[in-house]
């Protein structure tokens, strides 16, 4: 019961996880504009990984795709696989996981075939969220980096007499989506990995016993028997399990709280 | 058809203070930015004040700043700017104006009202 | 705060001559973001409020005659009148709607000979 729990629990939260991690990807506010010690513009602009927009006072808002490839910074382009790959990854998992879940019965698939299934999907949903998590990373950091040449650029001399406005952008909200996404997947995938544990058949192993009959010396060693019913009282066989003792853990993750400008 | 009027002007001694009015027709005002600008006798034109349609950004001109306040009720679809420390140099047309819809501009603008400020 | 400088301050012209009136800002009113200029141009005739005629450097508001165009980018910019007409006399501003506090110029009035 506990396994179902664990895994339905693993599929649930990768699934969240994963429509974060698609919803990150779509939205626009990566970057947003620095509202902070700036001159005071009609004008709010904010970024994404396929467009930028600009929202003005009147709430009229403009979008202009990134119409190019090859004119884009690599890093934005690594972002971008990033994000694809987590999401790819992210959705085959759960499709893996569906055929996967306990409570759900396909045919005549065995539980070592569910055990694996389990396996693969958790793999995928790390390996996802991971992908997630770095792309965001990725992004953040090249914002940091960009937000102090800015700003190093704002108090620094201008060469000619005429001054441009020099937008400096800040961390957006698609980027703790992508962080918060990312960890869930990461969670959701740890579980069903655990809850593969579970699934794996458990291999039983009975001692050999010999029975004496009359007149006979003959040592009957009944094979281990793959499943057990576990009723009645089994008198003649000691059974003994391999790996009896097994843990689950409670993975908890603790929401932070990030203020930005 | 979009109106925009303007009262409250008047004369004023210098220290005084008095509030105009702008009431408003013709489209949503609560959708949309407002501001007043005025323009002192046979002079050019000089933005005093913007707030937004939900009032979360005011802004003022250096020159009136901490001396006038700019406030709307959208409920009544009126602007007002209430004028404290009057002096000579704010002697103006007030127009009220509406924020347009698109490039920020000044699209549409009232009549104007007449603030004088003399002694 | 961004000043905005016109030149000339007036100028007398012909009817059906064409006239180009220019507009400077101490700081670039290109916003990158949406690749625009967030400048105005409005024209205001004696005895009457001023009234809209370009936004955003170059897009004429609705109703105004094809014969105003507005050009330029970041700090430099043009009202052209192609061919004046009588009811053309007024004076013209331009603004800076990018920046707060927004600023005017101090205007380009416009006379018939």
């Known amino acids: 019961m506990a396994v179902t729990a664990c895994q339905g629990l693993g599929f649930v939260v990768s699934l969240i996880g994963i429509a974060g991690i698609i919803a990150a990807t779509c939205m626009d506010q990566w970057s947003t504009q620095d509202l902070y010690n700036n001159p005071v513009t009609a004008v709010f602009n904010y970024q994404g990984l396929w467009r930028s927009c600009v929202r003005e006072s009147s709430g009229f808002t403009e979008c202009r795709g990134y119409f190019t490839l090859l004119g884009l910074p690599a890093m934005l382009q690594a972002v971008r696989a990033l994000m694809i790959v987590g999401i790819v990854l992210g959705a085959i998992g759960l499709l893996v996981s569906i055929f996967a879940l306990k409570c759900i019965r396909i045919g005549s698939m065995e539980d070592s075939a569910k055990a694996n299934m389990t396996l693969t999907s958790g793999i995928m949903f790390i390996v996802s969220g991971l992908c997630a998590i770095a792309g965001v990373s990725v992004f953040a950091n090249m914002l940091v980096t960009n937000f102090w040449m800015s700003t190093a650029n704002m108090y620094t001399g201008m060469g000619g007499m005429v001054q441009t406005v020099q937008t400096r952008y800040t961390f957006g909200a698609a980027l703790f989506v992508g962080w918060v996404a990312g960890g869930l997947t990461l969670i959701g995938g740890v579980m069903m990995c655990i809850a593969c544990r579970g699934l794996a058949p458990e291999e039983t192993n009975y001692k050999a016993v010999s029975y004496h009959a009359s007149g006979h010396s003959v040592a009957y060693k009944p094979g281990g028997f793959k499943a057990s019913t576990g009723f009645g009282s089994n008198t003649k066989n000691k059974k003994i399990y391999d790996g009896g003792a097994r843990t689950e853990d409670e993975v908890q993750s603790y929401p932070s709280k990030h203020d930005y400008v | 058809e979009v109106q925009l009027v303007e009262s409250g002007g008047g004369l004023v001694q210098p220290g005084g203070s008095l509030r105009l009015s702008c009431a408003v027709s013709?489209?949503?005002?609560?959708?949309?930015?407002m501001h007043w600008v005025r323009q002192a006798p046979g002079k050019g034109l000089e933005w005093v004040a913007y707030i937004s349609s939900g009032t979360t950004n005011i802004y003022y001109a250096d020159s009136v700043k901490g001396r006038f306040t700019v406030s709307r009720d959208n409920a009544k679809n009126s602007l007002y700017l209430q004028m404290n420390s009057l002096r000579a140099e704010d002697t103006a047309v007030y127009y009220c104006?509406?924020?347009?819809?698109?490039?920020?501009?000044?699209?549409?603008w009232g009549q104007g009202t007449l603030v004088t400020v003399s002694s | 705060d961004i000043v905005m400088t016109q030149s000339p301050d007036s100028l007398a012209v012909s009817l059906g001559e064409r006239v180009t009136m220019n507009c400077k800002s101490s700081?670039?009113?290109?916003?990158?973001?949406?690749?625009?200029?967030?400048l105005t141009w409005y024209q205001q005739k004696p005895g009457q409020p001023p009234k809209l005629l370009i936004y955003?450097?170059?897009t004429r508001e609705s109703g105004v005659p094809d014969r105003f165009s507005g050009s330029g980018s970041g700090t430099d910019f043009t009202l052209t009148i192609s061919s004046v007409q009588a009811e053309d006399v007024a004076v013209y501003y331009c603004?800076?709607?990018?920046?707060?506090?927004?600023?005017f110029g101090q205007g380009t009035k416009l006379e018939i000979k």
């Open positions: 603004q800076n709607v990018y920046i707060y506090p927004l600023t």
């Open positions: 955003w450097a170059s």
């Open positions: 013709g489209f949503t005002f609560s959708s949309f930015g």
């Open positions: 104006v509406r924020s347009g819809y698109y490039g920020s501009s000044l699209d549409y």
């Open positions: 700081q670039s009113l290109f916003n990158s973001g949406n690749q625009r200029n967030y």
